[in-house]
């Protein structure tokens, strides 16, 4: 299957098209509340969550979530059959992995059920909005006496589909060197010093091949090398070199 | 539109390999799910294996699970199918099978592009 099969429409902008519609002019009078905005995210393309702040009602209601995708067997809405509570109010629904459809324009809509009229559609790419999984299984090895190789695994998604953040450093560093790592799980460091003791972690997200996600995953777990002195306030060297 | 070209079939003994190609070409967007049906003489269609484009997830018949593997190289846009352990119950024509969806199955009905077939005949 093709590693093409990116970018569909990942370079479009996410489209937030909100329509609130209204009944006939004559029953203009008062206006039509707002509903809130609809975020969605894809979690390692294993289940989606579109959640929305239900605090932002006047009164505590149970919106409705519907969906469809733009171009598909079956152009009708359906319900979500997953709710997800805050407070025993709806604020979100999760849409299991057989729902999504990465690459076609994903159509949510959400409704007010007292009043069917105060809807608000809006239209996502949900390829753009994929958040892997923390990478995995870190390990260091060493490819010569002063040169560290770092390799990870990341789940589920394939790694080409992946683009990768590393960021080290050593107890005197104020700060962590970072790096774009693409496709390939791992890094090699050419030179290290082994009287420090080195730290590094990794992220990633789906980008750019597959989708244009500009949403990291979360930090895998630290991995360390090097002396096994206690780690240093690195503000201590705040005015070295 | 997909284009899907097979090939490597042909006969084996039993107990033998073989590993089916399978090239795609076209739109890139309508290969999200790839997979193998076979069908033998006066037998319905069967779904023996599928792949996805951005997911490492395979799904596998019962009937070929530990002998057939599905895999994919996509500089050259192709999808095998690694048959060993061949039975005579395999003999069949293979076809390549492909869906602008992720998460297909293995139901013919869930396809919307297919290739021509290669023949697979395994003796005993």
């Known amino acids: 299957w093709s590693s093409k099969v990116l970018m569909s429409s990942a370079n479009e902008d996410i489209k937030a098209d909100l329509i609130l519609t209204s009944t006939a002019p004559e029953h203009l009078s008062a206006p039509t509340l707002p509903l809130p905005e609809v975020q969605c995210f894809v979690f390692n393309i294993e289940y989606m969550n579109c959640t929305w702040n239900s605090s932002s009602e006047p009164q505590a209601t149970n919106l409705t979530l519907h969906y469809r995708y733009k171009v598909s067997d079956n152009n009708t809405f359906q319900e979500c059959s997953h709710y997800l509570f805050s407070k025993e109010i709806t604020s979100g629904c999760q849409i299991q992995k057989e729902d999504i459809q990465l690459y076609q324009t994903f159509v949510v809509q959400l409704q007010d059920p007292q009043k069917p009229q105060r809807r608000a559609v809006q239209k996502l790419n949900l390829q753009n909005l994929v958040i892997p999984r923390a990478p995995e299984n870190l390990t260091l090895s060493n490819l010569s006496e002063s040169q560290l190789e770092l390799r990870w695994k990341s789940r589920h998604i394939k790694e080409r589909c992946l683009q990768y953040l590393v960021q080290y450093r050593s107890n005197r560093d104020r700060s962590w060197t970072e790096l774009i790592v693409n496709h390939e799980p791992r890094f090699s460091l050419p030179s290290v010093d082994e009287l420090k003791r080195y730290t590094f972690r990794v992220r990633s997200r789906y980008n750019p091949i597959c989708g244009s996600s500009q949403q990291w995953s979360k930090w895998s777990q630290p991995v360390h090398w090097g002396s096994h002195t206690v780690e240093e306030n690195p503000s201590l060297f705040a005015l070295e070199a | 539109q997909v284009q899907l070209q097979e090939s490597g079939g042909g006969s084996v003994q039993a107990g033998g390999s073989l590993r089916l190609s399978c090239v795609a070409s076209?739109?890139?967007?309508?290969?999200?799910?790839m997979a193998w049906f076979r069908q033998a003489p006066g037998k319905e269609r069967e779904g023996v294996a599928v792949?996805?484009?951005?997911?490492?997830?395979?799904y596998y018949a019962d009937s070929v699970k530990g002998r057939f593997t599905i895999s994919e190289d996509n500089d050259k846009n192709t999808v095998y199918l690694e048959m060993n352990s061949l039975k005579p119950e395999d003999t069949a024509m293979y076809y390549c099978a492909a869906d602008g969806n992720l998460w297909r199955g293995l139901r013919p009905s869930e396809y919307t592009y297919w290739g021509q077939g290669t023949q697979v005949t395994v003796s005993s």
């Open positions: 076209g739109d890139v967007y309508g290969r999200n799910s």
């Open positions: 792949g996805y484009s951005v997911v490492t997830t395979t």
